[in-house]
Interface confidence: low
């Protein structure tokens, strides 16, 4: 088993955002395992009345890119690309504020879904953030 490697995305749940691009995985079994988790989470989300349209438009692709991060093609070793911190913060604090509060207090959701913690992401001006995955969230003025 490798320490982490890049492989084409083979799933369905996030195919419309990722296609068959290369994603970073930590073990051979990880992609299938995460696919099962995110499929279950999206099923829960789909039946929930707690998700607004303005949130889901960007939250779903963001969760997909967090679960299946693109490989950093600029790196000589397999490495995941981070989400962009500025977009993460707008998603959490503006577009999906109510939904995040609900999700973080709901063990059933947390069991199935890994929510990115924006504090863990590189600062926007840092070198590590130069190649972050941008979802296309409109920036607040």
């Amino acid at each position: 088993e490798e320490d982490g490697f890049c492989q084409p995305y083979r799933g369905i749940a996030c195919a419309r955002f990722i296609g068959n691009r290369t994603v970073y995985m930590e073990s051979l079994h990880m992609q299938g395992e995460i696919e099962n988790q995110i499929t279950a989470a999206f099923t829960m989300i789909g039946t929930s009345s707690h998700l607004s349209d303005k949130c889901s438009q960007f939250a779903i692709p963001s969760l997909c890119h967090y679960a299946f991060p693109y490989c950093d093609e600029t790196s000589s070793v397999p490495k995941p690309r981070d989400l962009c911190r500025d977009e993460c913060e707008i998603l959490e604090n503006v577009l999906c504020q109510t939904e995040y509060i609900f999700a973080r207090s709901n063990p059933m959701i947390l069991m199935r879904l890994k929510l990115p913690n924006c504090e863990d992401l590189p600062q926007p001006e840092s070198p590590e953030a130069a190649n972050c995955i941008r979802i296309g969230i409109p920036m607040a003025d």
Epitope: E26, M30, K114
Partner: nanobody, 111 residues
């Protein structure tokens, strides 16, 4: 940003036991996998054990049956229980979550 801090290393005799801890400054339950690596002097860093968010564990062949990885999400802490230690287990042990690393804790197995 999240900080990972390892502890529990030290000097132990062959056949002895140690329990390493990795405390995180934020929740580690959101990571899809978190694990332990080690680097012996003059050697490359290698994966020792990993646990996924669904509880699946992976162990390097050299530690199977001797080491046990576990996680306590309520304490934001990852553990590595190391039994029947051997001289070849001597290394700096690192906690890892995706591309985040701790500073390492030294384990020395010697009589």
């Amino acid at each position: 940003e999240v900080q990972l801090v390892e502890s529990g290393g030290g000097l132990v005799q062959p056949g002895g036991s140690l329990r390493l801890s990795c405390a995180a400054s934020h929740s580690i339950s959101r990571f899809y996998a978190i694990g332990w690596y080690r680097q012996a002097p003059g050697k490359q860093r290698e994966l020792v054990a990993r646990i996924s968010s669904m509880g699946r564990t992976y162990y390097a062949d050299s530690v199977k049956g001797r080491f046990t990885i576990s996680i306590d999400n309520s304490k934001n802490t990852l553990y590595l229980q190391m039994n029947s230690l051997r001289a070849e287990d001597t290394a700096v042990y690192y906690c890892n979550a995706r591309n985040l690393w701790g500073q390492g804790t030294l384990v020395t197995v010697s009589s």
